[in-house]
């Protein structure tokens, strides 16, 4: 999906109002310095591409993020403010359904959500030069 035509300011507002709080809740009890950010993005569409991938695609050691509260609200925001987004996700979601498990908060998942927090922070500061 090409995120170029999304309403970035509305997605940012939804992130600041609620998604960010859900990410913090997920990470509660974890030190903010515990994980190094290794995933980066260069502009808002790229950030949303990376956010979508980390949130919804199962990875080795962490298959459960797509069923978390922050994921549900992220999906809602992308569907509402990125034209055509919900239609493009049908095959991807159905392919993943069998692999998903609920509420297994592994260290790998915590690391992945830490990366997500970094991507969202970067998304919120689009004018910063890529480091």
């Amino acid at each position: 999906y090409d995120f170029t035509n999304c309403d970035f300011e509305k997605i940012k507002a939804a992130y600041l109002s609620t998604i960010s709080k859900d990410l913090i809740t997920y990470m509660s009890g974890t030190k903010s310095t515990e994980f190094n950010n290794t995933v980066s993005c260069s502009n808002r569409p790229h950030c949303l591409t990376e956010i979508q991938s980390l949130t919804f695609n199962p990875t080795a050691g962490c298959a459960s993020l797509a069923k978390e509260m922050f994921a549900m609200k992220t999906k809602a925001a992308l569907a509402i403010w990125c034209p055509g987004y919900s239609e493009t996700q049908i095959n991807a979601t159905q392919a993943m359904k069998k692999r998903r498990k609920r509420k297994v908060t592994t260290n790998k998942c915590l690391e992945q959500v830490s990366q997500l927090q970094g991507l969202w922070r970067r998304f919120n500061r689009p004018l910063l030069k890529q480091q």
């Epitope: 509305k10 507002a13 939804a14 600041l16 109002s17 609620t18 709080k21 859900d22 913090i24 809740t25 069923k67 509260m69 549900m72 609200k73 999906k75 809602a76 925001a77 569907a79 509402i80 987004y85 919900s86 239609e87 996700q89 049908i90 991807a92 979601t93 159905q94 359904k97």
Partner: antibody
Framework: QVQLQQSGAELVRPGSSVKISCKAS????????MNWVKQRPGQGLEWIGQ????????NYNGKFKGKATLTADKSSSTAYMQLSSLTSEDSAVYFC??????????????WGQGTSVTVSS | EIVLTQSPALMAASPGEKVTITCSVS???????LHWYQQKSETSPKPWIY???TLASGVPVRFSGSGSGTSYSLTISSMEAEDAATYYC?????????FGAGTKLELK
């Protein structure tokens, strides 16, 4: 304007199944989570689960897994809930409610009028 | 599962009286995830207060909401007849979504 129109009251036999509907209009049906909520007579509200019509993804309250099955038909902008193996405990009013961002806060912002299900022999 | 405990379960207030309904949450949640709904008999619930303190469209300004962490409240500064209803708090912080048992507010 956003509207959620639910199907009419149902009188069903114990052990049978029932499928109730919620027809949405006034918004992009595929892009919003649809929730279902149960209310027994004189009681409070209980969340059953939700479905994302765009891809059919569901989240259920564990208490209703095996009891409720949520589906959606994008072509008719209609969400469905099937209740199986009905008992008197399932006699209730069932609401559909859209999940949406209001002032960028996420909540159930529009509700259907409710469908009454009575289980009786 | 997050449990929401409302108090009182039932109360009566005279016109002009100040009313406070509380919602205690079993584990701390973000204030953005605590909502209130109003329900009158035989009708569907209506969104009333979003994210602890944001009034839904059309809600009179005599209503207000406050709280954080595990303690939230809905206040009516001056009770009016049309405020008689049942009020539910609800959390959207973790699955399963849960509601308080409700507070039935009657006119004295």
């Amino acid at each position: 304007q956003v509207q959620l129109q639910q199907s009419g009251a149902e009188l069903v036999r114990p052990g049978s199944s029932v499928k109730i509907s919620c027809k949405a209009s006034g918004y992009a049906f595929s892009s919003y989570w649809m929730n279902w909520v149960k209310q027994r007579p004189g009681q409070g509200l209980e969340w059953i689960g939700q479905i994302f019509p765009g891809d059919g993804e569901t989240n259920y309250n564990g208490k209703f897994k095996g009891k409720a099955t949520l589906t959606a038909d994008k072509s008719s902008s209609t969400a469905y809930m099937q209740l199986s193996s009905l008992t008197s405990e399932d006699s209730a009013v069932y609401f559909c409610a859209r999940g949406g961002y209001v002032n960028f806060l996420y909540a159930m912002d529009y509700w259907g009028q409710g469908t009454s299900v009575t289980v009786s022999s | 599962e997050i449990v929401l405990t409302q108090s009182p379960a039932l109360m009566a207030a005279s016109p002009g009286e100040k009313v406070t309904i509380t919602c205690s949450v079993s584990s701390s949640i973000s204030s953005s995830n605590l909502h209130w709904y109003q329900q009158k008999s035989e009708t569907s619930p209506k969104p009333w207060i979003y994210g602890t303190s944001t009034l839904a469209s059309g809600v009179p300004v005599r209503f207000s909401g406050s709280g954080s962490g595990t303690s939230y409240s809905l206040t009516i500064s001056s009770m009016e007849a049309e405020d008689a209803a049942t009020y539910y708090c609800q959390q959207w912080s973790s699955y399963p979504l849960t509601f308080g048992a409700g507070t039935k507010l009657e006119l004295k």
